[in-house]
Interface confidence: low
């Protein structure tokens, strides 16, 4: 059976070595194995981790678990059938769902967020759906670096 | 498809002339990955229509250079035409630049299926007149 000549790559993608971002005149270059789209860089994992493991993997690459500006943000992969951990967790202190940078979840982003179990973490499908799952479950994850 | 190949090969493939506001000199709404720009289409087209659509965007119908790229594209999009075809089931599969395509394409024994599709980490043959999502690529 023929298959593609393998490069010297890991069996599953993980964020690459910590490369300083190279700016060009009006935008950016992303690290190897990261996707550039609308002046953001995204790492889309193919391996599954718990929510905390995902958060730490993103942090180790000077990025954070995906914080969505709007449901069109991942338009380029809206055909994907997968769910991915994103950087949303429930804060007992603020009694609100907060992104990793401390900002509150817009009620317009996920209309069903009121039904989310506050003990769970949020997995997102790029066509706009979100669901809450045990934070110990393993999912793929998306890291994001905002570049401008 | 072969009549279009000639026309396609004579096309200019200079993506840098397009508006390049986004990462790594790619046109707006394209994505960058590993020194290439990709247009992730959502429209369904026949294989020949897809070929022409990519040519009109100064790029090529999706080519896949290695397993890593195939894995990445399968994460981004479940299926897409690729720039591989054959003139009939008696002819070899070839790429857009006329080179023999050596990798396995499923269902190759079906004489009606003469254009190739990437589908979730595998390559399959399909009817060239089918309406399938297409992606374009330009190497930086």
């Amino acid at each position: 059976k023929n298959s593609f000549t393998k490069l010297s790559i890991e069996p599953a993608f993980t964020p690459g070595p910590n490369i300083e971002l190279q700016k060009d005149s009006d935008c950016c270059s992303c690290q190897e194995k990261w996707v550039g789209y609308r002046c953001n860089c995204y790492f889309i994992s193919s391996e599954q981790k718990t929510w905390n493991e995902s958060r730490h993997l993103c942090a180790s690459q000077k990025s954070s678990l995906l914080q969505l500006q709007n449901t069109d943000e991942l338009d380029f992969m809206s055909s994907s059938q997968q769910f991915y951990w994103i950087g949303l967790s429930y804060s007992e202190e603020h009694t609100a769902w907060l992104w990793e940078n401390g900002s509150a979840l817009s009620q317009y982003l996920f209309p069903s967020f009121e039904t989310f179990n506050t003990k769970n973490c949020i997995a997102y499908n790029p066509n706009g759906n979100a669901l809450d799952e045990s934070c110990e479950d393993k999912n793929r994850y998306i890291c994001k670096q905002q570049l401008i | 498809p072969s009549t279009l190949i000639q026309r396609h090969n004579n096309s200019s493939l200079n993506t840098r002339t397009q508006k390049a506001r986004h990462c790594g000199h790619c046109p707006e709404e394209w994505i960058t990955y590993s020194n290439s720009c990709y247009y992730i289409g959502k429209e369904r087209r026949t294989w020949e229509e897809s070929l022409l659509a990519c040519t009109s965007k100064n790029s090529s119908l999706l080519s896949i250079d290695n397993e890593e790229e195939m894995k990445f594209l399968s994460i981004i999009s479940p299926s897409s035409w690729i720039g591989v075809f054959r003139n009939s089931s008696h002819h070899p599969w070839v790429t857009m630049n006329g080179l023999a395509f050596k990798h396995e394409i499923k269902d190759s024994d079906n004489a009606e299926l003469n254009c190739a599709v990437l589908q979730v980490n595998r390559l399959k043959s399909a009817q060239c007149g089918s309406s399938i999502i297409y992606h374009c690529k330009h190497k930086l």
Epitope: - | R44, T46, P78, Q119, V120, S130, S131
Partner: antibody
Framework: EVQLVESGGGLVQPGGSLRLSCAAS????????IHWVRQAPGKGLEWVAS????????DYADSVKGRFTISADTSKNTAYLQMNSLRAEDTAVYYC?????????????????WGQGTLVTVSS | DIQMTQSPSSLSASVGDRVTITCRAS??????VAWYQQKPGKAPKLLIY???SLYSGVPSRFSGSRSGTDFTLTISSLQPEDFATYYC?????????FGQGTKVEIK
Amino acid sequence: EVQLVESGGGLVQPGGSLRLSCAASGFTFSSYYIHWVRQAPGKGLEWVASISPYDGYTDYADSVKGRFTISADTSKNTAYLQMNSLRAEDTAVYYCARSSDFSPWTSSGGMDYWGQGTLVTVSS
Amino acid sequence: DIQMTQSPSSLSASVGDRVTITCRASQSVSSAVAWYQQKPGKAPKLLIYSASSLYSGVPSRFSGSRSGTDFTLTISSLQPEDFATYYCQQYGSSLRTFGQGTKVEIK
């Protein structure tokens, strides 16, 4: 010769269950999409569900989602439609059909081969 | 879901007539439309796929065309065996849908 043969239809009470089978022969089963399409007496065609036997990808019409389950056994070249919580409006002739499969989200042409159909009657 | 609105629901025609049946998709399905013929008590038969491709073994008097989201089945010269019900079907969406059908009767 390509053949699709349905079986398993019959009379069932509302709320009951039934499993239809579609035995395929004469083609490479896993290279095609298998569909169930139904036709209520004197009415038009309604697509019910689809499966890609190669990877098990399924789709359902909203009218049956959660009640019907489509599956396939590639070792037996057979597709199934498990129908639960049946209602009077599910009464129809159920056909299985195939179409070329190149992606879980589209099929390459129409449904080129059909079975002869099996009648499902839901009545008390 | 994508709706396929088919018209007319029935028509009367004579042998030799040119018959046109139309289907309008509620949103874009590209060329992913098929046409079928069905006779009473029988399974449907595929006539046209990809909007305009004639399925093998189907007489050339049948043809299909597309204009945007409008699809047309034309029978150039109606034959006695063509009296039947015709359906359009879209497969541009994973949730496939059929038109309501057009019954072609003898005038």
